[in-house]
């Protein structure tokens, strides 16, 4: 008789999840010499230990501490790029501008990017059928708590000028409920961070509006200012040209506004 299994509203664990995490870890540590000391089997064991046999609505940041410890990584604190609702462009940018880092350019972010996972209370099984949805089921689920934990640590590590890429095509360019708005903004350290610089990415070809004047950007500025951190904002009118100019800064067309 098959055992009754909790049905959650979200998609289940990504297929071949253990193999994917392990393979990503091996690949990352091969590419990044400073992480070659990392034992990927231990990383997987710590990752697994954070959610296996635990109720998937009762996960805490504490559960992820062994994994955080193993994945400790130093990135240049003044080269951090945060993003909200525009992951692909942010990643394309750091692939070209190799000295800047998104969270997904770190080991832990790379391991979990685009994956879903959860377990079940009192069994060592991984649930491939369904996992809790943040809104419909619970916020303290394995995936949400993981991203909240690594995002907090990433923001806490930042210094000097921190950049954030925001999606100018969305109704809320700055969304207080996003990971950036609810976690990263609040964990920038005023004693280390001098300025948060927002890059608002335009979607339309003919969009010449100054999206830095958007009410949600003004609210972000106000929130950041209350933290005693300076704020600046730039419109990126042509993201395609922006990337091109990062690749080829000496191009004559790259002196004009992008």
């Amino acid at each position: 008789v098959p055992r009754w299994r909790q049905q959650w509203s979200g998609p289940g664990t990504t297929k071949r999840f253990p193999e994917t995490v392990l393979a990503r870890c091996v690949k990352y540590t091969e590419i990044h010499p400073e992480m070659r000391h990392v034992d990927c089997q231990s990383v997987w064991d710590a990752f697994k230990g954070a959610f296996i046999s635990k109720h998937p609505c009762n996960i805490t940041e504490e559960d992820y501490q062994p994994l955080m410890k193993l994945g400790t990584q130093t990135v240049p604190c003044n080269k951090i790029l945060l993003w909200s609702r525009i992951k692909d462009l942010a990643h394309q940018f750091t692939q070209v501008q190799r000295d800047m880092f998104t969270l997904e350019d770190t080991l832990l972010g790379y391991l979990a990017d685009d994956l879903t996972w959860c377990g079940e209370f009192n069994t060592s099984k991984i649930n491939y059928q369904s996992c809790p949805d943040w809104r419909k089921d619970c916020s303290n689920n394995p995936v949400s708590v993981f991203w909240k934990t690594v995002s907090r640590r990433f923001a806490e590590a930042a210094c000097d000028v921190v950049h954030v890429m925001l999606n100018g095509s969305r109704s809320k360019i700055f969304d207080k409920n996003s990971t950036f708005g609810s976690v990263e903004v609040h964990n920038l350290q005023p004693e280390k961070v001098q300025t948060l610089e927002a890059w608002v990415i335009h979607g339309g070809r003919e969009d010449s509006r100054d999206l830095c004047q958007d009410p949600t950007i003004k609210e972000l500025e106000s929130i950041i200012s209350k933290r005693n951190i300076q704020f600046s904002c730039k419109n990126i009118y042509r993201p395609d040209k922006f990337l091109q100019c990062v690749k080829n800064p000496e191009d004559s067309s790259c002196t004009s506004e992008i």
């Epitope: 609040h186 200012s225 933290r227 300076q230």
Partner: antibody, heavy 114, light 110 residues
């Protein structure tokens, strides 16, 4: 943190108060203006941020201006079209850790009367 | 707008008792809340910031708690010196607000 002398003003006058800070830099901490009418609660007026951007309470927007001089370590509040309802003790406050108001000036009494 | 509602307006408690003051924000202020004590003729004094962190030199009898929109200040083992007016303040944003402070709570010690 210390506010300049207040005093007696007439209705329609313009109030100018200066706050002088020492022991910290205006490029590291913002400064808030708060007032308190006699026997009443605290009322936020506005705030100048580390980058120089200013913010105001909705009620104060139309007739208040906050400016700063980082060289002289001063922040100035200017409020136009005074009425008797503006009679209050005005405080200058440092915007401190986590945005809290951690260092308060002694306050200066402003009386508006004809 | 981030409007703050503070209750009660006044409370009377005997020496050694416990006083609880509540503050509600009209929307989430992400634990950016501070508490102040003001005695007659003096400027307010910061007691607690970030909802629960005790300011330097403040007695541990003062305890702050809460998150989201609901916050509480608890004064345990009330002393005569605690007689004052207490205010909460949201520290999340300085724009689009009517007032960042709650209306105040007068604490009378019997």
């Amino acid at each position: 943190v210390k506010e300049s002398e207040g005093g007696l003003f007439k209705p329609t006058d313009t109030l100018t108060l200066t706050c002088t800070v020492s022991g910290f830099s205006l490029s590291s901490y913002g400064v808030i203006w708060v007032r308190q009418a006699p026997g009443k609660g605290l009322e936020y007026i506005g705030f100048v941020a580390v980058g120089g951007t200013t913010y105001y309470a909705n009620w104060a927007k139309s007739r208040s201006t906050i400016t700063r001089n980082t060289n002289e370590n001063t922040v100035t509040l200017k409020m136009t079209s005074l009425t008797a309802a503006d009679t209050a003790t005005y405080f200058c406050v440092r915007n401190g850790v986590s945005g809290s108001s951690d260092i308060w000036g002694p306050g200066t009494l402003v009386t508006v009367s004809s | 707008a981030y409007d703050m509602t503070q209750t009660p307006a006044s409370v009377s408690e005997p020496v050694g008792g416990t006083v609880t003051i509540k503050c509600q924000a009209s929307q989430s202020i992400y634990s950016y809340l501070s508490w102040y004590q003001q005695k007659l003729g003096q400027p307010p004094k910061l007691l607690i910031y970030s909802a629960s962190t005790l300011a330097s030199g403040v007695s541990s009898r003062f305890k702050g708690s809460g998150s989201g929109t609901e916050y509480t200040l608890t004064i345990s083992g009330v002393e005569c010196a605690d007689a004052a007016t207490y205010y909460c303040q949201q520290d999340y944003s300085g724009s689009n607000v009517d007032n960042t402070f709650g209306g105040g709570t007068e604490v009378v010690v019997k």
